[in-house]
Structures are given as structure tokens and as C-alpha cells.
Interface confidence: low
């Protein structure tokens, strides 16, 4: 079972959180965007999205970097920085951002009702839209065996998540994705077809991506990727507003 919480698209850019926690490797991020008929955004595309109101409080992959787009300064989101904040120490798993070239130029909150480029597979994939509607598909999108293979839980795998919020400058609600802290059950590997036994959370330690670029701010992992505890319950099925956890 894989749950993919997605946000509205801003200039084609959107945020994807998997299974309510930082659990996407760089290779899986590319595969995931591809499944959405999208690509990892470039820095320029992310900056364009920022300019039309896109901000979150979650680290996610773009092409070459791990970033948080920030419009309003917030001490618990990218350490009060604004702009496209780059995480300079990225050796872990994060969320991802994707870019859909055919999306409207500004904001698009229509529900996603397909994962067009997923292929046949045994996994139940649920797309959770900002309005709470769900699209369920059985299939697979990962191609890197390390993203599929059995993995071992670490502290990061059970860390709490935080809000992915829509900017108040675009005049709307705050959208919070909800993260549940829970241990990873042992897995037998990709040959398992019972999706209830499959909650991959493999680490991609081999990846290291440089930071840098214009119109950006930089930070180390400690600048915002901290662990927190759950502040409250969550309504994961109805309405766009979800109770946040301590943002990372």
C-alpha cells in the first residue's frame, strides 16, 4: 500500500508526500514524477511556481537539489528563510516535487484521477488529492530495485511529518499533509504480492547532490529537518485542512 498525498499545481509544480513521511529516494522521486506524466522541476520552474503562490514546509527533490519553497518567513519552515531554500546536506529521503508541463500557468486544484504512467504491479497506490478525494490504482511506478527491495527501519523512517501549505498570498486555505509515525514491518521483498505487507522505506545513502544556484537560500539539514512529535489528530478523509505536526 502506497499513499501519495499531492498538492494543487502551481505553474505546473506540485508536492508529493509518500506514506505520510519523508520516504522517497532520489531515484524513486524521478520514477514517481514520471508516473504522474511529469518530471522533477528545474530550479527555474520551482522559482516560477513560487512566484505564483507555491510554498510548502517540506523538503523535496527537484532536479539536482532538495528544497523548500517559501514565500512567508516561518521559523519552523526552512529556518525563517524565503525563496527556494536549498538543503545543503541531503543524504536522506525526502518528499518530492514534480512538474507537469501541461498544467495551467498559475494555480490548478482539480483532482488528479489517474497515475497515467504507472505500470502493472501488485501495489495498491492511493492518490490523495487536496480536497480529500482519493484515486486508487493497482500497479507500480518504481524501477530501482533499491526502492523496492526490503529495507530496514531507522529513526528517520518513523519521524513525524509536517505541513505542506498553500500560501496565504494566494488567498486560500492551508493544506496540511498528515504524517503518521509508525514502524516499518519486516518485508520479504518485491515478490510479496500482498500489499498489506509492503511498506518500503529504503534508504538511498549512495546519493549526494550538490547545492547552489541563483535566487536561493541554503541550509544544512539541521536548519529544518528536525524530528517532532504529533501535535494532534488528523482528518485524512474530508476537507482540505489537516492538523499539522511539527514542521520539518
Amino acid at each position: 500500500q502506497i499513499d501519495l498525498n499531492i498538492t494543487c499545481r502551481f505553474a505546473g509544480v506540485f508536492h508529493v508526500e509518500k506514506n505520510g513521511r519523508y520516504s522517497i529516494s532520489r531515484t524513486e522521486a524521478a520514477d514517481l514524477c514520471k508516473a504522474f506524466n511529469s518530471t522533477l522541476p528545474t530550479m527555474a520552474q520551482m522559482e516560477k511556481a513560487l512566484s505564483v503562490g507555491f510554498e510548502t514546509c517540506r523538503y523535496g527533490f527537484i532536479e539536482g537539489h532538495v528544497v523548500i519553497p517559501r514565500i512567508q518567513p516561518n521559523s519552523i519552515c526552512a529556518a525563517n528563510h524565503t525563496g527556494v531554500y536549498i538543503l545543503t546536506s541531503n543524504t536522506s529521503q525526502y518528499d518530492t516535487y514534480c512538474f507537469n508541463a501541461s498544467a495551467p500557468p498559475k494555480e490548478d486544484c482539480t483532482s488528479v484521477t489517474d497515475l497515467p504512467n504507472a505500470f502493472d504491479g501488485p501495489i495498491t497506490i492511493t492518490i490523495v488529492n487536496p480536497d480529500g478525494t482519493r484515486y486508487i490504482k493497482k500497479g507500480e511506478y518504481r524501477t530501482n530495485p533499491e526502492d523496492i527491495y526490503p529495507s530496514n527501519p531507522t529513526d528517520d523512517d518513523v519521524s513525524s511529518g509536517s505541513s505542506s501549505e498553500r500560501s496565504s498570498t494566494s488567498g486560500g486555505y492551508i493544506f496540511h499533509t498528515f504524517s503518521t509515525a509508525h514502524p516499518i514491518p519486516d518485508e520479504d521483498g518485491p515478490w510479496i504480492t500482498d500489499s498489506t505487507d509492503r511498506i518500503p522505506a529504503t534508504r538511498d545513502q549512495d546519493a549526494f547532490y550538490p547545492s547552489g544556484g541563483s535566487h536561493t537560500t541554503h541550509g544544512s539539514e539541521s536548519a529544518g529537518h528536525s524530528h517532532g512529535s504529533q501535535e494532534g489528530g488528523a482528518n485524512t478523509t474530508s476537507g482540505p485542512v489537516r492538523t499539522p505536526q511539527i514542521p520539518e
Epitope: F119, G121, T143, P145, E146, N152, E187, W191, Q205, D206
Partner: antibody, heavy 117, light 108 residues
Amino acid sequence: QVQLVQSGAEVKKPGASVKVSCKASGYTFTNYAMHWVRQAPGQRLEWMGWINTGNGNTKYSQKFQGRVTITRDTSASTAYMELSSLRSEDTAVYYCARFYSGSGSPWGQGTLVTVSS
Amino acid sequence: EIVLTQSPGTLSLSPGERATLSCRASQSVSSSYLAWYQQKPGQAPRLLIYGASSRATGIPDRFSGSGSGTDFTLTISRLEPEDFAVYYCQQYGSSPLTFGGGTKVEIK
């Protein structure tokens, strides 16, 4: 740099046991499962099983079930594969492997186990 | 278990030529969970391709993989001297993980 370094060659008599070690470095040992694969002379590669290095849980190929035991020592970042009731057809090179990564699939250098009376 | 049959057993080619290696599975390989390895004498296998068609980091683009279901192909577009080796396919979609018997690519 991710590296898996295995113990040296062994010569064993039929019926004996052998224990091969695999020391990992360059990554967090408990974050990845470790697999064991063997290759008899001129034969195809054979998967033996794997261990969840975090909790110690194992999964073995049916062919080796009951004869193979895979363990790990997290403090030493080392995985072990013990094969018992050795027979001549167990003569092979035994590899530990951290399946997989888009940046490569780290394998140990291999340990030759010779079973001979 | 899934049995992987590789053909041909030996491929005799010259540097610069194109090599096409086949791997056929006895039953469908789930979600294209298929990898290709290169092995040289006295060395451990080296991962070339995973997910049937994704190249591992550092693998030259002359190596490409294709196929799904039961039929998979590894293509080396232009053989270099260092490419002469044994190539194995492996499925990791069902237990036990299994390997093909290998194709030896030798210099003609």
C-alpha cells in the same frame, strides 16, 4: 565509498560447517538488507537468502532452508553466512551483496569454499 | 521458481560490433523486476541494468536493456575490448531470486 570485504578462502571436509563473514563500510549497515549468493565452478549464480540487518529477520531460498543461517553483528557492521552439512557440490565462491542501487550493486570480493575429503 | 534461460550461450563478435543478448523467463517477471550483470573472471558480478531498462550509475550508454513479461534483451551497441565477459540476467520479482545461465561474449 561503499565496500563489502569478505573473509578468506576456506577448505572444509564433507559434513562440516563453514562461516563466511562480510564486513560493510561506507554506509549505514543497518539501513540495507544483505543478501548471499553463491557460484559453483562454471555454474550460474544462486541466491541463498537475505537478512534484514536492522532487526535480524531472515529469508532463505528453499534449496538451502535448514542448512544455511545468516546472522549479523551490527556493532561490527558485519554479516555472516553459515552453511552446514557441507558436501562436495557446495564447493563454490560465496558472495555477500547489498542489492541494489542505481549507483551500483556493491558485492563482496567473494570467498572460495572448497569441500573436499 | 522462475527459470531464466539465456541465449545464445556464447556470442563471438569483434570490437565495434553490436551484441544482442536474450533472457527468457519461464513465467512473467513481475513489474519488469529484471537486472543484468557483467562478470569477468575472478571478479564479482557488476550491475549494469535494473528494472529491465534503467542503467546503473557509471554504466556507459552503449549498454541498454529492454523487454517486459517473459522476454528481455540486453544490447551492447558497440563492443569495446573491456566488454568481453559473461553476462547474467536476474529476476527479483518472486522468491527465490534467480539468475540466468549466462551468455559469454567472446572476441571473434
